[in-house]
C-alpha cells in the first residue's frame, strides 16, 4: 500500500480468482483513543471499533472511503483504491491502446518545434468518475524539470456503438535549448483513477522523435505565362523553430486529381517554392518535415488548382 | 527517406555538401545496423545514449546560432579553445566563433573516426562476420575532415590485446552510430546556417 495523495491510498493486488488479497491496517487520524467506530462509503454498518481497523482487501467491494467516527462526528477518511497486477503486468483497463506507432501505445505525444513544449493525448471509452494527473521530467534517475498543465477533455468521437473521449495535456521543459542534443529522454507519467480503480501509464521519448511541424503557411499559386505550369510558393509555419537556416525544413509538393484513384505527382524540395503542372479540378498540397532528422511529416496545406 | 542531394554551386559554402553526404551515410549505416543486429538492443529506446565527445569538444555551444545566444538554457560553458585555420572559412566570413565552431566539428569527426576504425578492426575478427562499417561512411568522414582542413595532432588508433567481446562491440557500435547520427544532424544544421549567413 502507498499514498497517492493525502488520505488516498493505493493497494496493489495480484489479481486472480480466489487470491488472498492484501491485509491493510487503517489508522484514524485523531488524538482520540476510545469510542471510535469505522464505516465504509455511505453504509452505516459498523465494520470495527478502535483507533485502527484491519481489513483484508481482495476485490473492489473492499475498496472505497473508510471513515472513522466518534459519537456521530467524522474524525478522518481514508480512500482505498485498487491497482490490479495481472500475471506480472499492471492492468490497462482505463485507456485505449492507440496501436500507433506500435501496439501498447496508450499515450501519444507530439511537438511542433524544438522549444521543449509538447502535447500528449490519450483515449478512453469511460465518460464518468474519471480523473487524470500528469507528471513529467527529463530523465528519471536525476530528473530535470518539466511542467505540465491539467489534463482536459479535448475531443469526443463516436466509434461504432461506443463513444470515445480524447484527453490531452500540454507540457513545457523548464530550461530547454532548441539546439541541444538530447541524451536523456523525456518521461511522462499519467495517473488514471476510474471509480476505485487506479492505473498508471508512462511514455518515454526524445523531443526530436516526436517532432511534427505545423503545415506550411501562405500557400499560393502563380500561373506561369503561356504554360500549364504554376509556381507554388509557401512559408515556414509560424510555430517552427528559428532561425530557419539552422532548423531547416524539407517539403513535399503533391498534385492530386479530384479522384483518389488518379496518379499523384510528387516533388521533394528544400526550397519554399516549386513549379508544377496544374491539372483541371486538381489540388496542390504541401507538407513539411525536419530536413535533417526524419520525424513525422506535417499535415497537408492545400489549395485548388482552378 | 533519402535526404535530398544538394549539388553545391561553386560559390557555396564548401562544407555543406560534405556534411549532407555525412548525414546520409551515417543514417544508412545506422539503418543497416538496426536491421542486421535485430536480435541486439540497437534501437533508440534500448540503447544508452552516450556522447564520446562529452567534455572534450563543445560543438553545440560553439556552433550556436546567434539568435539562440540570448537563450540562457543554451549557454553552457564555452571553455574549449581550438586551432583556427580551416579552409571552409571564406575569408570574409572568418570570425573567432566560427573558427571555434568548425574546429570543434573537426575534433568530433577525428574522435569518431578513431572509434569507428578501432571498432571495424574488431568486427573483422568476428567469426560470424555479421556486420562491418560502411567504407563509404568512413570515406565521407575523411572528406569532410579534409574540407575543414585543420592542423591537428593525429590520434593513434587504439589497439587492444585482449580477445574482443563481439556482443559488446556490436552494442557499442549501435551506441556510437546513434550518437554520431545526432552529431551529424547538428553538423548539417550548422553548415546550413553558415551557408545562409
Amino acid at each position: 500500500i502507498w499514498e497517492l495523495k493525502k488520505d488516498v491510498y493505493v493497494v496493489e493486488l495480484d489479481w486472480y480468482p480466489d487470491a488472498p488479497g492484501e491485509m491493510v491496517v487503517l489508522t484514524c487520524d485523531t488524538p482520540e483513543e476510545d469510542g471510535i467506530t469505522w464505516t465504509l462509503d455511505q453504509s452505516s454498518e459498523v465494520l470495527g471499533s478502535g483507533k485502527t481497523l484491519t481489513i483484508q482487501v481482495k476485490e473492489f467491494g473492499d475498496a472505497g472511503q473508510y471513515t472513522c467516527h466518534k459519537g456521530g462526528e467524522v474524525l478522518s477518511h481514508s480512500l482505498l483504491l485498487l491497482h490490479k497486477k495481472e500475471d506480472g503486468i499492471w492492468s490497462t483497463d482505463i485507456l485505449k491502446d492507440q496501436k500507433e506507432p506500435k501496439n501498447k501505445t496508450f499515450l501519444r505525444c507530439e511537438a511542433k518545434n524544438y522549444s521543449g513544449r509538447f502535447t500528449c493525448w490519450w483515449l478512453t471509452t469511460i465518460s464518468t468518475d474519471l480523473t487524470f494527473s500528469v507528471k513529467s521530467s527529463r530523465g528519471s534517475s536525476d530528473p530535470q524539470g518539466v511542467t505540465c498543465g491539467a489534463a482536459t477533455l479535448s475531443a469526443e468521437r463516436v466509434r461504432g456503438d461506443n463513444k470515445e473521449y480524447e484527453y490531452s495535456v500540454e507540457c513545457q521543459e523548464d530550461s530547454a535549448c532548441p539546439a541541444a542534443e538530447e541524451s536523456l529522454p523525456i518521461e511522462v507519467m499519467v495517473d488514471a483513477v476510474h471509480k476505485l480503480k487506479y492505473e498508471n501509464y508512462t511514455s518515454s521519448f526524445f523531443i526530436r522523435d516526436i517532432i511534427k511541424p505545423d503545415p506550411p503557411k501562405n500557400l499560393q499559386l502563380k500561373p506561369l505565362k503561356n504554360s500549364r505550369q504554376v509556381e507554388v510558393s509557401w512559408e515556414y509555419p509560424d510555430t517552427w523553430s528559428t532561425p530557419h537556416s539552422y532548423f531547416s525544413l524539407t517539403f513535399c509538393v503533391q498534385v492530386q486529381g479530384k479522384s483518389k484513384r488518379e496518379k499523384k505527382d510528387r516533388v521533394f524540395t528544400d526550397k519554399t517554392s516549386a513549379t508544377v503542372i496544374c491539372r483541371k479540378n486538381a489540388s496542390i498540397s504541401v507538407r513539411a518535415q525536419d530536413r535533417y532528422y526524419s520525424s513525422s511529416w506535417s499535415e497537408w496545406a492545400s489549395v485548388p488548382c482552378s | 527517406r533519402n535526404l535530398p542531394v544538394a549539388t553545391p554551386d561553386p560559390g557555396m559554402f564548401p562544407c555543406l555538401h560534405h556534411s549532407q553526404n555525412l548525414l546520409r551515410a551515417v543514417s544508412n549505416m545506422l539503418q543497416k545496423a538496426r536491421q542486421t543486429l535485430e536480435f541486439y538492443p540497437c534501437t533508440s529506446e534500448e540503447i544508452d545514449h552516450e556522447d564520446i565527445t562529452k567534455d572534450k569538444t563543445s560543438t553545440v555551444e560553439a556552433c550556436l546560432p546567434l539568435e539562440l545566444t540570448k537563450n540562457e538554457s543554451c549557454l553552457n560553458s564555452r571553455e574549449t579553445s581550438f586551432i583556427t585555420n580551416g579552409s571552409c572559412l571564406a575569408s570574409r566570413k572568418t570570425s573567432f566563433m566560427m573558427a571555434l565552431c568548425l574546429s570543434s566539428i573537426y575534433e568530433d569527426l577525428k574522435m569518431y573516426q578513431v572509434e569507428f576504425k578501432t571498432m571495424n578492426a574488431k568486427l573483422l575478427m568476428d567469426p560470424k562476420r555479421q556486420i562491418f562499417l560502411d567504407q563509404n561512411m568512413l570515406a565521407v568522414i575523411d572528406e569532410l575532415m579534409q574540407a575543414l582542413n585543420f592542423n591537428s595532432e593525429t590520434v593513434p588508433q587504439k589497439s587492444s590485446l585482449e580477445e574482443p567481446d563481439f556482443y559488446k562491440t556490436k552494442i557499442k557500435l549501435c551506441i556510437l552510430l546513434h550518437a554520431f547520427r545526432i552529431r551529424a544532424v547538428t553538423i548539417d544544421r550548422v553548415m546550413s546556417y553558415l551557408n545562409a549567413s
Epitope: P17, E59, F60, G88, I89 | -
Partner: antibody
Amino acid sequence: QVQLVQSGGGVVQPGRSLRLSCAASGFTFSSYGMHWVRQAPGKGLEWVAFIRYDGSNKYYADSVKGRFTISRDNSKNTLYLQMKSLRAEDTAVYYCKTHGSHDNWGQGTMVTVSS
Amino acid sequence: SYVLTQPPSVSGTPGQRVTISCSGGRSNIGSNVVKWYQQLPGTAPKLLIYGNDQRPSGVPDRFSGSKSGTSASLAITGVQAEDEADYYCQSYDRGTHPALLFGTGTKVTVLG
C-alpha cells in the same frame, strides 16, 4: 472453490459451426479476464483467444481471426467460443482458463472437424 | 508459430536433477514473467511455477524456476516417477499481450 465446467464439443464437418461454453463458479466471474487455449492431438498448447473482464476488448490468434468469436455473459457467469468455418486443423481439445498469475483451467472439451 | 523454444525431450533416473530450458527473445521472456506447466496424459495443464520462480502452494519444492535475460529454465531436483509428463513454459510478448505464448513443450522421461 474455483470451478470451470466446459461443454459444447463434438464432431463437426468442415465449414460448419460449433459453440463452446465454459460455466464458471466459486469466484466473481465478472472481475477477471478469460482465455481459450487448444491442443491438437499429440501437439503442444496453442493460445486461441482472450476477453477482458467486461467484454470490452477481445484478442485472437491469427489462425482463428475472423472465424472464431469469444464472448461472455457475466450475468450467467459463462464464457463462450463461437467457431465458424471450421477446418480439419481446428481439431483439438479446447480449454477455457482464467487470466492471472495463478490460473484455473476447465476440464477440456474435444472438437473434431472431419468429413 | 512457437517463439519459445524448449528441448523436445529430457530424461533422468529417479533422484537425478533434470533441467528444461525455454529460450525466447527481448520482447517476450526478456520483458515478461514466465510460467511453467505440467501436463499429465489426458488432463488439463497444471501450474508449477508463476512469476519466473514462484511456486504455488501444493507444488513440491523439488520444482524450481529461474529466468536470466531471454531464457528461463525449470529444474526438478530429485526427479520422481510421477514427474513423467509434458512440461510447457509460457510468457507474453510486450507487443501482443495478453496473448499467451507457449513453449514447444518438453517430454520428461524417468528411466528405470
